[in-house]
Interface confidence: low
C-alpha cells in the first residue's frame, strides 16, 4: 500500500493503489543542500547528481569515525523523499546536491551562504528550467542568510525550508524567518504537529505551511536497496520540495509568489490539532497541511489571496506592528489583532513604493499584531482612500469613489485610548455596501482597487449577545479579501482572516457582561475576477 | 514469513509487574508503528498503546496512562509493554498488532493471557 | 474520545443468506484532506487474534474474499457478507482509526441459523 505520507498529500482523483499523479516534474531541478549522499541507490540513481561543491565543519570530537554510510543517511533519505523512484514525491525531478553539513549534520552559515552563491553563478552560466532548492537546515536567526535567500528568491529561486526541530517560534531560526522562503513545519499521521524526544517541529506566523515528516519511509544509505523511517521537518521541506517540482513542471512560468499561494490554496485546511502549540502562538500558526493540486492545470483563474502576521510590536505606549506582502503581491486589506484588546486600530500606508499594514498599540496594551491580507491580482491598480474623524455623530464613512474601483477592505485607526466605550455604536446604513464606516472618532482607510473583471461584495454576520469569536465566510468561487468588525463593539480584540473566513475576537464573555454594546459583527469583503476565469478558459 | 511471536504473559499480584515482548519477521519493522490491544475475557477489544516507526511518538489509553510503557528495540525487531502497577481489570489476553502507519492493525500476534490475581 | 455502537450483537443467519452488521461513530471519521473514512472491520474467530477485513471503510484488504463489503461515510458504516458461508461464524469489531485513542464496537456475533 502507498505509505501514508505520499497518501496524505495526493488529492482523491489521483489515487490508485500506486501513487503516480501526472508528470513527475521533470522539466524542474531541485538543489539539495545537505549532507553527502549515497548517488547509487536504487531510489535516486541516476536522478542526482552529486556537485563538486563541498563547505563543511571539522566533525566534533577526538574519538568520531567517519562512517560512510552515516555520513550520507541524512542527505539520501531526503533525495529520496523528493525523487525517489518507489517513496519519492516528484519521481521526475532531478536533483544535485551539495555538500553544506557534516558528517553529524552540522554546518555553518558562511558554507550554506557559498552553497547558496554556487548555486547563483550556475544558474546565470547555464540558466536551465525552473530551481528549487531545498534547505533541510536550521540555526540561529542570521540576517546574512536571510538577505541570501531574500538574493536567491528575487532571482526567479524557489527556496523551500525546514521550519526546524526546536519545538520553538520558526521567527527565531534561519533561513526559516527569511520572509522569501517557503518554510514548512512537520504533521504526522494523526495530523498531530510532530513532536522529536522533548522538543518537535517549530510554529508560528514565519511558518507557511506544514507537511507530513513523522516515520516518513525513504532511501537509507546502510545500502543501496535499504529502505529507513526518518522524521524531522527536514522530511516535511522534501515534501513541500517535491511539490513545488510537480507544480512548476506543471506551470513553468509560475513566480515564487504564485507558487505560494497556491500551495496554501491546495492545502488540507484546519486538521491539524492546534492545542499542541503554546496558545499564543496558535492564532500565528498556519493550519494547513500540503497537498498536491487536485488538477495541476487550470487554476490560473482563481483570486488567490492569503494572511501575512507582522511581529509582536512589543508594549510600549507607542508602539506599532507592520506586515507586508511580497513584491508580486497586493495589499489589499489591514486588520490588526491585541490579545488584551488595548490597540488603535492599524491603517494602510505606503513604504518604499509599496502599501504596508502598519497596526497601533494603546496605553496599557500589551502590543498588537498587523494582519496584512496579500492577493494576486495581475493588472491591478490600488490605492488607499481616508476620511479624518467626522464631525456628525453619524461616524466616519468613507467609499471608493473612482471609476471601476471596488472596495477590498477596510480599516480604522484612532488616536483616542478608549474609543467606543463613550460612543454608541454606528450603524451602517443599509443599502450603502460599498463603504468603510467607522466612530466619528477615527479615521476610516478604504482599500480601493481597479483590476480587469473584478467584483466585490460585503457580508456580514452579527451576534447580539456577547461571543468570543464570530466569523463570517465567503462563499465558493468567491475569495476573501478584506475582514474587519463594525463599530460599536468596545470588547473587540481584533479581526483577521483565515483562509477564506473572517474571524472577529472579542473580550471572554464573562469580563464584559452582555450590554448594549455586547453586538458584534464580522465584515467580511468577498471578491472574484472575471477576467482571470475568462482567461484560463481560453487557455483550455 | 511475516509474522508477530509474543511472550511474556502470566499470572501477576495486584500492584505487580511484568513485561511482555512481541519479536516481528517478515517486514521492515522500522517502518511501521505497532500497538498493542487486549481482551478481557468475553469482552471486546481495547486499545492500550501505539509506538511510531522510530520510537518518537508514543500513545495510552487513559486507562494505563502512568502505569505502561511501550517500547522497541530497532536492532532485535521487538517491540515490549512494561506493564506496572498491575490491577485486577487488566487481566485479559494482550495481542501486539502491527499499524499500518494509519491506525488500523494488518498483522496480529496470536496473543498472550496476563491475569491479576491474588 | 469517539464511541463506536454495533447493531446488533448477535446475528443468526442461514447459510448463503446475507448478513448485514451496522456500526456508528459518536462523530465523523471521514478525513476532509483525503476524503477517506479512518474505520476498519476485523473478523475474530473462537481462539485466534482478530483479522483485518476492511479498511478505509470499504476497501478489502488483500485475500479477504469478495463476499465482504463495507460502505458508509461520516457516522454511519454497514459491513455485509454477500452471502454467509460456514467459515465466516466469528465475531466482527468495527474500528476507527481517526484519531487517539483507537476506539473499537462492542462486537457482533455472527451465527448461522
Known amino acids: 500500500s502507498i505509505p501514508w505520507n505520499l497518501e496524505r498529500i495526493t488529492p482523491p482523483r489521483y489515487r490508485a493503489d500506486e501513487y503516480q499523479p501526472p508528470d513527475g516534474g521533470s522539466l524542474v531541478e531541485v538543489y539539495l543542500l545537505d549532507t553527502s549522499i549515497q548517488s547509487d541507490h536504487r531510489e535516486i540513481e541516476g536522478r542526482v547528481m552529486v556537485t563538486d561543491f563541498e563547505n563543511v565543519p571539522e566533525e566534533d570530537g577526538t574519538r568520531f569515525h567517519r562512517q560512510a554510510s552515516k555520513c550520507d543517511s541524512h542527505g539520501t533519505h531526503l533525495a529520496g523523499v523528493v525523487s525517489g523512484r518507489d517513496a519519492g514525491v516528484a519521481k521526475g525531478a532531478s536533483m544535485r546536491s551539495l555538500r553544506v553539513l557534516n558528517c553529524q549534520g552540522k554546518g555553518t552559515v558562511s558554507g550554506t551562504l557559498i552553497g547558496l552563491e554556487f548555486i547563483r553563478k550556475s544558474q546565470l552560466v547555464q540558466p536551465v528550467g525552473p530551481l528549487v532548492v531545498l534547505l533541510p537546515l536550521a540555526g540561529g536567526y542570521s540576517r546574512v542568510l536571510n538577505a541570501a535567500c531574500q538574493r536567491l528568491a528575487r532571482a526567479g529561486v524557489v527556496l523551500v525550508t525546514a521550519a526546524g526541530n526546536f519545538r520553538d517560534d520558526a521567527c527565531l531560526y534561519s533561513p526559516a524567518s527569511a520572509p522569501e522562503v517557503i518554510t514548512v513545519g512537520a504533521t504526522n499521521a494523526q495530523d498531530q504537529p510532530v513532536t522529536l524526544g522533548t522538543l518537535g517541529t517549530n510554529f508560528g506566523r514565519c511558518v507557511d505551511l506544514f507537511a507530513p515528516g513523522e516515520d516518513i519511509i525513504g532511501a537509507s544509505s546502510d545500502c543501496s536497496t535499504c529502505f529507513v523511517s526518518q522524521s524531522g521537518t527536514s522530511q516535511a521541506a522534501a515534501h513541500v520540495a517535491g511539490i513545488a517540482a510537480m507544480m512548476l513542471s506543471a506551470e513553468p512560468e509560475l513566480t515564487l509568489a504564485e507558487l505560494r499561494q497556491r500551495l496554501i490554496h491546495f492545502s488540507a485546511k484546519d486538521v491539524i490539532n492546534e492545542a499542541w502549540f503554546p496558545e499564543d502562538q496558535r492564532v500565528l500558526t498556519p493550519n494547513l497541511v500540503a497537498a498536491l493540486p487536485p488538477s495541476t492545470h487550470g487554476a490560473g483563474w482563481q483570486l488567490f489571496c492569503r494572511t501575512v502576521w507582522s511581529a509582536h510590536s512589543g508594549p510600549t505606549r507607542m508602539a506599532t506592528a507592520v506586515a507586508r506582502c511580497a513584491p508580486d503581491e497586493e495589499l489589499l486589506s489591514c486588520s490588526s489583532f491585541s490579545r488584551s484588546g488595548k490597540r488603535r486600530g492599524e491603517r494602510m500606508e505606503a513604504q518604499g513604493g509599496k502599501l504596508v499594514c502598519r497596526a497601533h498599540n494603546a496605553f496599557g496594551g500589551e502590543g498588537v499584531y498587523a494582519i496584512a491580507r496579500c492577493c494576486l491580482l495581475p493588472q491591478a491598480n490600488c490605492s488607499v482612500h481616508t476620511a479624518p474623524p467626522a464631525e456628525a455623530s453619524m461616524g466616519t464613512r468613507v467609499h471608493c469613489h473612482q471609476q471601476g474601483h471596488v472596495l477590498t477592505g477596510c480599516s480604522s485607526h484612532w488616536e483616542v485610548e478608549d474609543l467606543g466605550t463613550h460612543k454608541p455604536p454606528v450603524l451602517r446604513p443599509r443599502g450603502q455596501p460599498n463603504q468603510c464606516v467607522g466612530h466619528r472618532e477615527a479615521s476610516i482607510h478604504a482599500s480601493c482597487c481597479h483590476a480587469p473583471g473584478l467584483e466585490c461584495k460585503v457580508k456580514e454576520h452579527g451576534i447580539p449577545a456577547p461571543q468570543e469569536q464570530v466569523t463570517v465566510a465567503c462563499e465558493e468561487g468567491w475569495t476573501l479579501t478584506g475582514c474587519s468588525a463594525l463599530p460599536g463593539t468596545s470588547h473587540v480584540l481584533g479581526a483577521y482572516a483565515v483562509d477564506n473566513t473572517c474571524v472577529v475576537r472579542s473580550r471572554d464573555v464573562s469580563t464584559t457582561g452582555s450590554t448594549s454594546e455586547g453586538a458584534v459583527t464580522a465584515v467580511a469583503i468577498c471578491c472574484r475576477s472575471r477576467h482571470l476565469a475568462q482567461a484560463s478558459q481560453e487557455l483550455q | 514469513e511475516v509474522q508477530l511471536v509474543q511472550s511474556g504473559g502470566g499470572l501477576v499480584q495486584p500492584g505487580g509487574s511484568l513485561r511482555l515482548s512481541c519479536a516481528a519477521s517478515g517486514f521492515t519493522f522500522n517502518n511501521y508503528a505497532m500497538n498493542w490491544v487486549r481482551q478481557a475475557p468475553g469482552k471486546g477489544l481495547d486499545w492500550v498503546s501505539t509506538i511510531s516507526g522510530s520510537g518518537g511518538t508514543t500513545n495510552y489509553a487513559d486507562s494505563v496512562k502512568g502505569r505502561f510503557i511501550i517500547s522497541r528495540d530497532s536492532s532485535k525487531h521487538t517491540l515490549y509493554l512494561q506493564m506496572n502497577s498491575l490491577r485486577a481489570e487488566d487481566t485479559a489476553v494482550y495481542y501486539c498488532?502491527?499499524?499500518?502507519?494509519?491506525?488500523?492493525?494488518?498483522?496480529w500476534g496470536r496473543g498472550t493471557t496476563v491475569t491479576v490475581s491474588s | 474520545d469517539i464511541q463506536m455502537t454495533q447493531s446488533p450483537d448477535s446475528l443468526a443467519v442461514s447459510l448463503g443468506e446475507r448478513a448485514t452488521i451496522n456500526c456508528k461513530s459518536s462523530q465523523s471519521v471521514l478525513y476532509r484532506s483525503n476524503n477517506r473514512n479512518f474505520l476498519g472491520w476485523y473478523q475474530q474467530k473462537p481462539g485466534q487474534p482478530p483479522n483485518l477485513l476492511i479498511y478505509w471503510a470499504s476497501t478489502r484488504e488483500s485475500g479477504v474474499p469478495d463476499r465482504f463489503s463495507g460502505s458508509g461515510s461520516g457516522t454511519d458504516f454497514t459491513l455485509t457478507i454477500s452471502s454467509l458461508q460456514a467459515e465466516d461464524v466469528a465475531v466482527y469489531y468495527c474500528q476507527q482509526y481517526y484519531t487517539t485513542p483507537y476506539t473499537f464496537g462492542q462486537g457482533t456475533k455472527v451465527e448461522i441459523k
Open positions: 498488532a502491527k499499524d499500518s502507519n494509519w491506525g488500523n492493525f494488518d498483522l
